[in-house]
Amino acid sequence: CKAMHVAQPAVVLASSRGIASFVCEYASPGKATEVRVTVLRQADSQVTEVCAATYMMGNELTFLDDSICTGTSSGNQVNLTIQGLRAMDTGLYICKVELMYPPPYYLGIGNGTQIYVIDPEPCPDSDF
């Protein structure tokens, strides 16, 4: 049974607006038509699900309406964007990819992307 390798960048810095983007790329052992991508956040050994989307190859990723994630897919690459991040959200963001259909099922977990978020400095008070 072949393994499925998932690659993601080691470090990403969020923008001053609290937006972080990274690519999650998987080496598909087969020709999957249905793929599920999950982003998990690990901080202090606690793991929580940030967002998840299931998509059909060739179609757009659809996250829930209230999700902080958006994304697009191109072949075996998923471009993920996480919004609304604050300094307290700094942590390791793990990309998990599942090839749901057709069988056989495959699961791959990336090494994680350390996302650093720095809250912007407040604007100095204006004299005017």
Epitope: A3, V47, L107, I109, G110, G112
Partner: nanobody, 115 residues
Framework: EVQLVESGGGLVEPGGSLRLSCAAS????????MGWYRQAPGQQRDLVAH???????MYADSAKGRFTISRDNAKKTVYLQMNSLKPEDTAVYYC?????????WGQETQVTVSS
Amino acid sequence: EVQLVESGGGLVEPGGSLRLSCAASGSISSYNVMGWYRQAPGQQRDLVAHIASNGEIMYADSAKGRFTISRDNAKKTVYLQMNSLKPEDTAVYYCKLWVLGNDYWGQETQVTVSS
């Protein structure tokens, strides 16, 4: 180096139960997924169930209702409780561990359901 040690396989009559165990040794990431696959003669190796360290569980359709997966994070051990076994559950069962950036297979354990 990560190693997986399985136990609990054997011969059981139809309708009986077995509990498989798989213990991981070595250093593994705090987020990980442990699970079971099985391979019947002449068939491909198929997922039975898996469970993540944060408790998320997935079952294959063939395992729903009769099989229960659980784990002890402190012992780095996963269990597969198999009830109401049928002859078609006869297969070689494999433990699998997914960690950040890697995965590992255990040694096989044979499960035979026959009267």
